[in-house]
Amino acid sequence: MKVLQEPTCVSDYMSISTCEWKMGGPTNCSAELRLLYQLVFQSSETHTCVPENNGGVGCVCHLLMDDVVSMDNYTLDLWAGQQLLWKGSFKPSEHVKPRAPGNLTVHTNVSDTVLLTWSNPYPPDNYLYNDLTYAVNIWNENDLADSRIHNVTYLKPTLRIPASTLKSGISYRARVRAWAQHYNTTWSEWSPSTKWYNSYREPFEQR
């Protein structure tokens, strides 16, 4: 049994880190493998993660961590029974992938503006709360080429766009993702998308 692609891990900088890797051949990850992880300091407790399959040769493990802080560094040992397949380390604060924003809502009650709001995925006492910026993807359901990205570089999780910049009488979808500047993180996953109908009509004299 051999590791083809070594584990790579990302942390949500709260309590969950996710590690993914590929094996040399088809593997029943949960039956054959265990990922052991231990905080590097004195003789900290060793924890065990049971991986799941992620495609034929891929495995994924969700490591539960007791409140990740900046100082934490973990050793990782990938075992197949009594055989150590791989040994590495992982510092969560240096491999942050933010949680996805939630509660994306579209407000169209203001006549000429589409207002999108969403929730910051972190509580205010987390350092990432004031460090997130966002990308909002809006696309035309009937024409995938009619797609745009709006970068939201201010802290407030809102975006206003003139309804006139969208085609009238068309259904649009939007989704949002986040990243943290200070930590130079990867982008979060996209939020679930939300749909609305653009009923905006230009004033008669502008037609």
């Epitope: 590097v40 007791d66 409140d67 100082m71 006492d125 987390n126 350092y127």
Partner: antibody, heavy 121, light 107 residues
Framework: QVQLQESGGGLVQPGGSLRLSCAAS????????LTWVRQAPGKGLEWVST????????LYADSVKDRFTISRDNAKNTLYLLMNSLKPEDTAVYYC??????????????WGQGTTVTVSS | DIQMTQSPSSLSASLGDRVTITCQAS??????LAWYQQKPGQAPKLLIY???RLQTGVPSRFSGSGSGTSFTLTISGLETEDLATYYC?????????FGQGTKLEIK
Amino acid sequence: QVQLQESGGGLVQPGGSLRLSCAASGFTFSSYSLTWVRQAPGKGLEWVSTIKARGGTTLYADSVKDRFTISRDNAKNTLYLLMNSLKPEDTAVYYCAKPLYNNFAGHFGSWGQGTTVTVSS
Amino acid sequence: DIQMTQSPSSLSASLGDRVTITCQASQSISSYLAWYQQKPGQAPKLLIYGGSRLQTGVPSRFSGSGSGTSFTLTISGLETEDLATYYCQQDYSWPLTFGQGTKLEIK
């Protein structure tokens, strides 16, 4: 606002025990790692011990490991430090400290006023 | 363990002076550095976190810079109330460590 109030310090003989408490208010106690820092007379700051928010992880300086035990009661918003086998070099002002954000252990934005522990015969 | 070395260990400066205190880490700590001020008989007070971020309520004459292994705390115009001992602290790896302190006196 955040308040941290230590108590339990005093004079104790070498080899004796003491339990320090830190009563906290003004923040969500159960969301933060909390730390004890000490300062010997005329000396600098020294990290003693940290307990993570849920209490599952405890960390100690080598100088106190196996003698001191940090614990917390999230229902009572109180942090503790049980000090056994005390030595004269444990004589110091003991501070409890809270980090600015819950994903830091240090970067202490709030400190108690300190409680004095004197180990002497 | 990461050693934090402050220099100078003490300094004397005049009111209005620009004062610089440095902190050297024995290995890279990215920007996980905090600066504290401690006045006699008081608990320490956080001035700077994340290497350069000013804590709320701290006068703007205080500033922090640096990343990696070399950090600086600057007081741009020394005032009487700045008489204190200043400590740096790394938040990068266990165990948490402080510098030995820099005692600032007013000439």
